[in-house]
């Protein structure tokens, strides 16, 4: 069974979908579509890198434009740096800026709902 | 004002390789895909894949799968598109066309002005 | 892939004739079409996108309606400018199809 065929069997029970299971979904070439991605829990896509979205997506990764205001989108992109959104090649905006660090104070994050950045 | 430049016309024998050209200006070039869509005389409109400008990541029609290759050069904002082992059916107007994501996966707005290629012995 | 079923593959009419082409997706595809005219020799030109929004400088006679699978575009008199054909696209699948064309004539 190819990555499409297994995505076509499990695709009703991807809305619960942990964090672990996408990302290994990313590695199988499911290209899941952008009605099934703005399903799943925002909390399952954050920590997603743009590499792992993009191979979840393939060609549907284009659909990502249309869709940056909306969660789950729009919340994952302000988790990730801007030179990676940038790989893209859809000139999606509002990432972590270049020289930008990370902090992750899961308190501050889950008060704010963005997480905090230290300047350069 | 955005404009999409082709290569010119091309004359190719059957099992050459034929590549186009598609230099893009008035606006950021890594910030849509580029598409390529063929048209054989009197007939229609047919998608053959696209281009992530970006990182170069190309997804293709099956139909062209193993015989096209798209790439792009950042640095000029060019698009190309490289069609092998041609035969007389794959003599056609060759365009690229650039999509506006206002919706779903965005629609092409902008098109080049078409590259005839001819396949002929 | 999604088919786009376009009909008729031609057509003719008279000057101020209403013009009537459909195209049929082989899936739901929600609004998610573009029409499209080509005259020959000349690149495609949007008319239409998301079923019925019409691109500026496009005339108000040029209409759309539909969802699901089933589109209408319209001509509501018909004009000597008109003469093209006429080509449906859908956008809900990343692989883009169109339908196979209207060939618009004058009577």
């Known amino acids: 069974m190819n990555g499409s065929e297994y995505f076509v069997k499990i695709q009703s029970f991807l809305g619960g979908a942990p964090t672990e299971d996408l990302k290994a979904l990313s590695q199988q070439n499911v290209s899941m579509d952008l009605a099934t991605f703005m399903k799943l829990r925002t909390d399952a896509v954050l920590p997603l890198t743009v590499a792992e979205v993009q191979k979840l997506l393939g060609p549907h990764v284009e659909g990502l434009k249309a869709e940056e205001r909306h969660r789950p989108v729009r919340d994952w992109i302000l988790r990730q740096r801007q030179d990676d959104l940038d790989t893209l090649g859809l000139g999606l905006q509002g990432g972590i800026p270049n020289g930008y660090l990370v902090l992750d104070l899961s308190m501050q994050e889950a008060l704010s709902g963005t997480p905090c950045l230290l300047g350069p | 004002e955005v404009q999409l430049v082709q290569s010119g016309a091309e004359v190719k024998k059957p099992g050459a390789s034929v590549k186009v050209s598609c230099k893009a200006s008035?606006?950021?070039?890594?910030?849509?895909?580029m598409h390529w869509v063929r048209q054989a005389p009197g007939q229609g409109l047919e998608w053959m894949g696209n281009?992530?400008?970006?990182?170069?990541?190309?997804y293709y029609n099956e139909r062209f799968r193993s015989r096209v290759t798209m790439t792009v050069d950042k640095s000029t904002s060019t698009a190309y598109m490289e069609l092998s082992s041609l035969r007389s059916e794959d003599t056609a107007v060759y365009y690229c066309?650039?999509?506006?994501?206002?919706?779903?996966?965005?629609?092409?707005?902008?098109w080049g002005q078409g590259t005839t290629v001819t396949v002929s012995s | 892939d999604i088919q786009m079923t376009q009909s008729p593959s031609s057509l003719s009419a008279s000057v101020g004739d209403r013009v009537t082409i459909t195209c049929k997706a082989s899936?739901?595809?929600?609004?998610?079409i573009a029409w499209y005219q080509q005259k020959p020799g000349k690149a495609p030109k949007l008319l239409i996108h998301?079923?019925?929004e019409l691109q500026p400088g496009v005339p108000s006679r040029f209409s759309g309606s539909g969802s699901g699978t089933d589109f209408t575009f319209t001509i509501s008199s018909l004009q000597p400018e008109d003469i093209a054909t006429y080509y449906c696209l859908q956008y809900a699948n990343p692989l883009r199809t169109f339908g196979g064309g209207t060939k618009v004539e004058i009577k």
């Open positions: 998301y079923t019925s």
């Open positions: 066309a650039r999509p506006y994501y206002g919706s779903s996966y965005g629609y092409f707005d902008y």
């Open positions: 281009i992530n400008p970006s990182q170069g990541g190309p």
């Open positions: 899936q739901d595809i929600n609004k998610y």
């Open positions: 008035g606006y950021t070039f890594t910030n849509y895909w």
